[in-house]
Interface confidence: low
């Protein structure tokens, strides 16, 4: 025969209020026999929850019909839940006794408990762009949740974050809490493909934490670096200068030349390449008429790269028959 | 007797997404968490994620389906779903549905969508 | 993840004759509260996979009394006392501790 076993799946039954709870209890023997009552609690001071002989139990149900003789489903619910209802509930066999029945069993208990998800974890980060070196401050909000116990992390890159400060309201009691978190991440030059993460984990989210995530890419401001030079190859009368603009980011650049202090409208030629580390390189390539008669020529690159204060580069052609070294100097 | 039916095979093309339904009756719904298994041809049982309806939309998935799996359940019509999103041709499999208490034990299954992914 | 391991992979059995099948957890599934979250699936050829025991040694309403399961912590057993030819499919174990739930390989169970 095999021994009775009390089977109480849940270890924790998360209800809402007003919502039915079903506390499932299963049995593996009808023996021995007796009844099955269900408590709230341990000890002398346990409270009877049901007792399917005598007793009166309005927002109590049975999920079967205990009056079956091979019944071995002892599973109940709870109608209209309310914050009273919480606590740990046995179902417990009894076995037959004189003068009264004589407990025999009790099941591992599942703990009641009002609880509700927080909500998936919202970060948002600085109003505006930050170079790199720089402290900015990502916002991470969560709503909606309850028991209050609330675990929050910080994550940059997948790398746990410890400069942050967190707070759950209201901090009495209540139906149900928010977390708000405001964490501090200095800014690298190659952060523009990393990310941070907000981490929430809860004790209905059974081991799963949610995550809200925002991309450094939208906070930082990587600004470029400018080299102008005049390609060794003279074609005729024409020199071929070009300017590189290196690690900038975002994409958003304007680039204009400038002749002697006149700015060109003719077409150059121009490429746009992406880095590994996300951020982009412009390269821009000019065309200048020369002749053995003309003054020397000051080429200018300008770059105004994301609505910034425009950085510029300059090089002095210095043209004669026999073309000469070139020079280049910068301006701030 | 709970028992969970899913809907009809379907056949997808790569790049796209699939729904599959689970609509359970004789039992009670919400309480219960509804998980989804899936089963490759010839090979075994594998976890894609649940939801207990009770305790809203918020579902556990399977780290390798995160992100391309989606799992609802609508209490109204006591039906649970599942998205998976960027089908490529290894997603062609028998997909289940499973009734369990709690995340645990699942006591009750579905008769599986065969999704077959092909160009 | 739990990672379970079923043995063997295929199990040629004689009707009447008594068969066994094997499963390890690579952690302990014994709960607090006492009872192993290890559970036994019998996935009929052609069929969805039915519960055939639960939290270890416990018998599935409706599943007949030839199947038990026994084990502790992380060594489990299936044992099926006569099998039958009904009984051929693939057995699967599942530890129902924590997500994700994780599933045995299986184990090919065919009439010789």
């Known amino acids: 025969e095999e021994e009775l076993q009390m089977i109480q799946p849940e270890k924790l039954l998360l209800v809402t209020v007003g919502k039915t709870a079903t506390l499932h209890c299963t049995v593996t023997s009808l023996l021995p026999v007796g009844p099955v009552l269900w408590f709230r609690g341990v000890g002398p001071g346990r409270e009877l929850i049901y007792n399917q002989k005598e007793g009166h139990f309005p927002r109590v149900t049975t999920v079967s019909d205990l009056t079956k003789r091979n019944n071995m489903d002892f599973s109940i619910r709870i109608s209209s839940i309310t914050p009273a209802d919480v606590g740990t509930y046995y179902c417990v066999k009894f076995r037959k006794g004189s003068p009264e029945n004589v407990e025999f069993k009790s099941g591992p208990g599942t703990e009641m408990a009002l609880g509700a998800k927080p909500s998936a974890p919202v970060v948002l980060g600085p109003a505006a762009r930050t170079t790199p070196e720089h402290t900015v401050s990502f916002t991470c909000e969560s709503h909606g949740f309850s028991p209050r116990d609330i675990t929050l992390k910080w994550f940059k890159n997948g790398n746990e974050l410890s400069d942050f400060q967190t707070n759950v309201d209201p901090t009495g009691q209540s139906v149900a809490y928010s977390i708000r978190s405001t964490a501090r991440v200095v800014l690298d030059p190659w952060d523009v493909r990393s990310q941070v993460i907000c981490e929430v984990a809860h004790v209905t989210l059974q081991g799963d934490p949610l995550r809200g995530t925002a991309n450094l890419s939208e906070a930082i401001r990587v600004p470029p670096t400018l080299e102008v030079t005049q390609q060794p190859m003279r074609v005729g009368n024409q020199v071929n200068v070009t300017c590189q603009v290196r690690k900038f980011y975002p994409q958003s650049l304007q680039l204009t030349w400038s002749e002697n202090g006149n700015v060109c409208q003719r077409e150059t030629a121009s490429t746009l390449t992406e880095n590994k580390d996300g951020t982009y390189n412009w390269t821009s390539w000019f065309l200048v008429n020369i002749s053995d008669q003309r003054d020397d020529v000051v080429l200018t690159c300008q770059v105004k790269h994301d609505g910034q204060l425009a950085v510029s580069k300059r090089l002095a052609l210095e043209v004669t028959v026999h073309q000469k070294d070139q020079s280049s100097d910068a301006t701030p | 007797q709970v028992q969970l039916v899913q809907s009809g095979a379907e056949v997808k093309k790569p790049g796209s997404s699939v729904k599959v339904s689970c609509k359970a009756s004789?039992?009670?719904?919400?309480?219960?968490?509804i998980s989804w298994v899936r089963q490759a041809p010839g090979q075994g049982l594998e976890w894609m994620g649940g939801?207990?309806?009770?305790?809203?939309?918020?579902?556990s998935y399977a780290q390798k389906f995160q992100g391309r799996v989606t799992i609802t359940a609508d209490e109204s019509t006591s039906t649970a779903y599942m998205e998976l999103s960027s089908l490529r041709s290894e997603d062609t499999a028998v997909y289940y549905c499973?009734?369990?208490?709690?995340?645990?034990?699942?006591?009750?299954w579905g008769q599986g969508t065969l999704v077959t992914v092909s160009s | 993840d739990i990672v379970m391991t079923q043995s063997p992979l295929s199990l040629p059995v004689t009707p009447g004759e008594p068969a066994s099948i094997s499963c390890r957890s690579s952690?302990?599934?014994?709960?607090?509260?006492?009872?192993?979250?290890l559970d036994w699936y019998l996935q009929k050829p052609g069929q969805s996979p039915q519960l055939l025991i639960y939290?270890?040694?416990s018998l599935q309403s409706g599943v007949p009394d030839r199947f038990s399961g026994s084990g502790s912590g992380t060594d489990f057993t299936l044992k099926i006392s006569r099998v039958e030819a009904e009984d051929v499919g693939v057995y699967y174990c599942?530890?129902?501790?924590?997500?994700?739930?994780?599933f045995g390989g299986g184990t090919k169970v065919e009439i010789k």
């Open positions: 499973a009734r369990g208490v709690g995340d645990d034990t699942l006591t009750d």
């Open positions: 004789g039992g009670t719904f919400s309480n219960y968490a």
């Open positions: 939801i207990i309806p009770i305790f809203g939309s918020t579902a």
């Open positions: 952690q302990s599934l014994l709960h607090s509260n006492g009872y192993n979250y």
């Open positions: 939290a270890a040694s």
């Open positions: 599942m530890q129902a501790l924590q997500t994700p739930l994780t």
